[in-house]
C-alpha cells in the first residue's frame, strides 16, 4: 500500500481549525493478523529524507498521538489529550487518517508528517509516510478560511476547506 496526501499545503488564518489528511491507497490487508500503527509528528525540510526528524506537535509526541488497530477498525486519540491540547488524530474504515488542530496559532506553522506502519503477525513490517505543509497567517493578507492546495501537479486549482 501507499500513503497519499490529498493536499500538500494548507494555508489558514490564526484561530481557525484545520484537519490535515492522509489516505491509505492500494490493497490494504484486513486480515486478522494485520494491524496498523498510525501516528503524526512534525518535521523539517532540507533533510536528506523528509520526515526523518520526529518533533512533537503542540508538545505531544508521536507516541501520544498514535493509533493502533486492526485493518478494518476506526480509532481516535484519547478525548483527554484532544481537549487539553486542541488536537485529535483519527482513522476511519476507508483508509482516511487525519489530525485536527483547533484554534491555530503562528507557532503551528511547519511540516507535518503522517506515518503508517503495517504490522503483520510475527515480524514483517511495511512503513510509509506522507508530508504536508501548514502555513498559519495573520493580518490582512490572511485568508478568511483555510485554503488547501492539492498535491497532484495536474490539479493546481485552489480548494477552500469547508
Amino acid at each position: 500500500f501507499k500513503v497519499a496526501t490529498p493536499y500538500s499545503l494548507y494555508v489558514c488564518p490564526e484561530g481557525q481549525n484545520v484537519t490535515l489528511t492522509c489516505r491509505l491507497l492500494g490493497p490494504v490487508d484486513k486480515g486478522h493478523d494485520v494491524t496498523f500503527y498510525k501516528t503524526w509528528y512534525r518535521s523539517s525540510r532540507g533533510e536528506v529524507q523528509t520526515c526523518s526528524e520526529r518533533r512533537p506537535i503542540r508538545n505531544l509526541t508521536f507516541q501520544d498521538l498514535h493509533l493502533h488497530h486492526g485493518g478494518h477498525q476506526a480509532a481516535n486519540t484519547s478525548h483527554d489529550l484532544a481537549q487539553r491540547h486542541g488536537l485529535e488524530s483519527a482513522s476511519d474504515h476507508h483508509g482516511n487518517f487525519s489530525i485536527t488542530m483547533r484554534n491555530l496559532t503562528l507557532l503551528d506553522s511547519g511540516l507535518y508528517c503522517c506515518l503508517v506502519v503495517e504490522i503483520r503477525h510475527h515480524h514483517s513490517e511495511h512503513r510509509v509516510h506522507g508530508a504536508m505543509e501548514l502555513q498559519v497567517q495573520t493580518g490582512k493578507d490572511a485568508p478568511s478560511n483555510c485554503v488547501v492546495y492539492p498535491s497532484s501537479s495536474q490539479d493546481s486549482e485552489n480548494i477552500t476547506a469547508a
Epitope: 494491524t35 501516528t39 526523518s52 526528524e53 520526529r54 507516541q63 498514535h66 493502533h68 506502519v117 503477525h121
Partner: antibody
Framework: QSVEESGGRLVTPGTPLTLACTVS????????MSWVRQAPGKGLEWIGI?????ITYYANWAKGRFTISKTSTTVDLKFTSPTTEDTATYFC??????????????WGPGTLVTVSS | AYDMTQTPASAEVAVGGTVTINCQAS??????LAWYQQKPGQRPKLLIY???TLASGVSSRFKGSGSGTDYTLTISGVQCDDAATYYC????????????FGGGTEVVVK
C-alpha cells in the same frame, strides 16, 4: 551499539547525585531513552523517558524526584534529593521507536546507588 | 493511570513442563506489550514484543498472546536455563504511568 551507566555510589540522604548514561553507536537525536531502577531483591520500576525531541515524561511516583536530560552523547538522571528508598541498581535503556513496538531493545549493565546515613 | 498487574508472583515447574504467566494492564494497551527475562545480577533480556512477536535469537518455546488489557507468556518444554524472573512492560503510553512494568514472576525449575 551499547549503553553504559556511571556515577552510582554511596551517598547520604539529600546529597546531590547525577547518573550518566554514555551511549556508543546510538544517535540520541533520533532515539528514545529511558531510566529504569531495581531495588535489591525487588522488581523493575520505570522512572521516565526522554524522546528524541527532548520531551520527558516521568512515572507518577517519580515526578519531582528525578530529572532526565541529555547531551549529544549522554543521558543523565539527576536526583532531586535522594532518600534511602532510592537505593537501587539504575538501568539506562533504549526504546524501540522505529519498529514502533515501544519495547526496550537495549539495556545497560546498571549502576548501583546506595543511599544511607 | 497505567499500571501493570502480573500473576503469579512465583511459579514452580518441572523440567519439560509448561508455565503460564499473566499480565493485566489497567487500560487497553493495544498489543504494545513486551516480555523480559532477567537472571540474578544481569540486565533484563527482551523476549517478546508487540504481545506475540519473538525477539531475535529467542527460542520458540516462548510464546506471547493476548490483546486489550490481558496478556500471557507461555513457556513450554521448560529447561533449567529458563529459571529466571519474567517481567511484562506496556509501551502504549508514557503519560500518567504508575509503573510500565509488571511486578515480576519468579520461575523456579525443579
Amino acid at each position: 551499539q551499547s549503553v553504559e551507566e556511571s556515577g552510582g555510589r554511596l551517598v547520604t540522604p539529600g546529597t546531590p547525585l547525577t547518573l550518566a548514561c554514555t551511549v556508543s553507536g546510538i544517535d540520541l537525536s533520533t532515539n528514545v531513552m529511558s531510566w529504569v531502577r531495581q531495588a535489591p531483591g525487588k522488581g523493575l520500576e520505570w522512572i521516565g523517558i526522554i524522546f528524541d525531541s527532548d520531551i520527558t515524561y516521568y512515572a507518577n511516583w517519580a515526578k519531582g524526584r528525578f530529572t532526565i536530560s541529555k547531551t549529544s552523547t549522554t543521558v543523565d538522571l539527576k536526583f532531586t534529593s535522594p532518600t534511602t528508598e532510592d537505593t537501587a541498581t539504575y538501568f539506562c535503556a533504549r526504546y524501540d521507536t522505529y519498529g514502533y513496538s515501544y519495547s526496550i531493545d537495549l539495556w545497560g549493565p546498571g549502576t548501583l546507588v546506595t543511599v544511607s546515613s | 493511570a497505567y499500571d501493570m498487574t502480573q500473576t503469579p508472583a512465583s511459579a514452580e515447574v518441572a523440567v519439560g513442563g509448561t508455565v503460564t504467566i499473566n499480565c493485566q494492564a489497567s487500560e487497553d494497551i493495544y498489543n504494545l506489550l513486551a516480555w523480559y527475562q532477567q537472571k540474578p545480577g544481569q540486565r533484563p533480556k527482551l523476549l517478546i514484543y508487540r504481545a506475540s512477536t519473538l525477539a531475535s535469537g529467542v527460542s520458540s518455546r516462548f510464546k506471547g498472546s493476548g490483546s486489550g488489557t490481558d496478556y500471557t507468556l507461555t513457556i513450554s518444554g521448560v529447561q533449567c536455563d529458563d529459571a529466571a524472573t519474567y517481567y511484562c512492560q506496556q509501551g502504549h503510553s508514557s503519560r500518567n504511568v504508575d509503573n510500565a512494568f509488571g511486578g515480576g514472576t519468579e520461575v523456579v525449575v525443579k
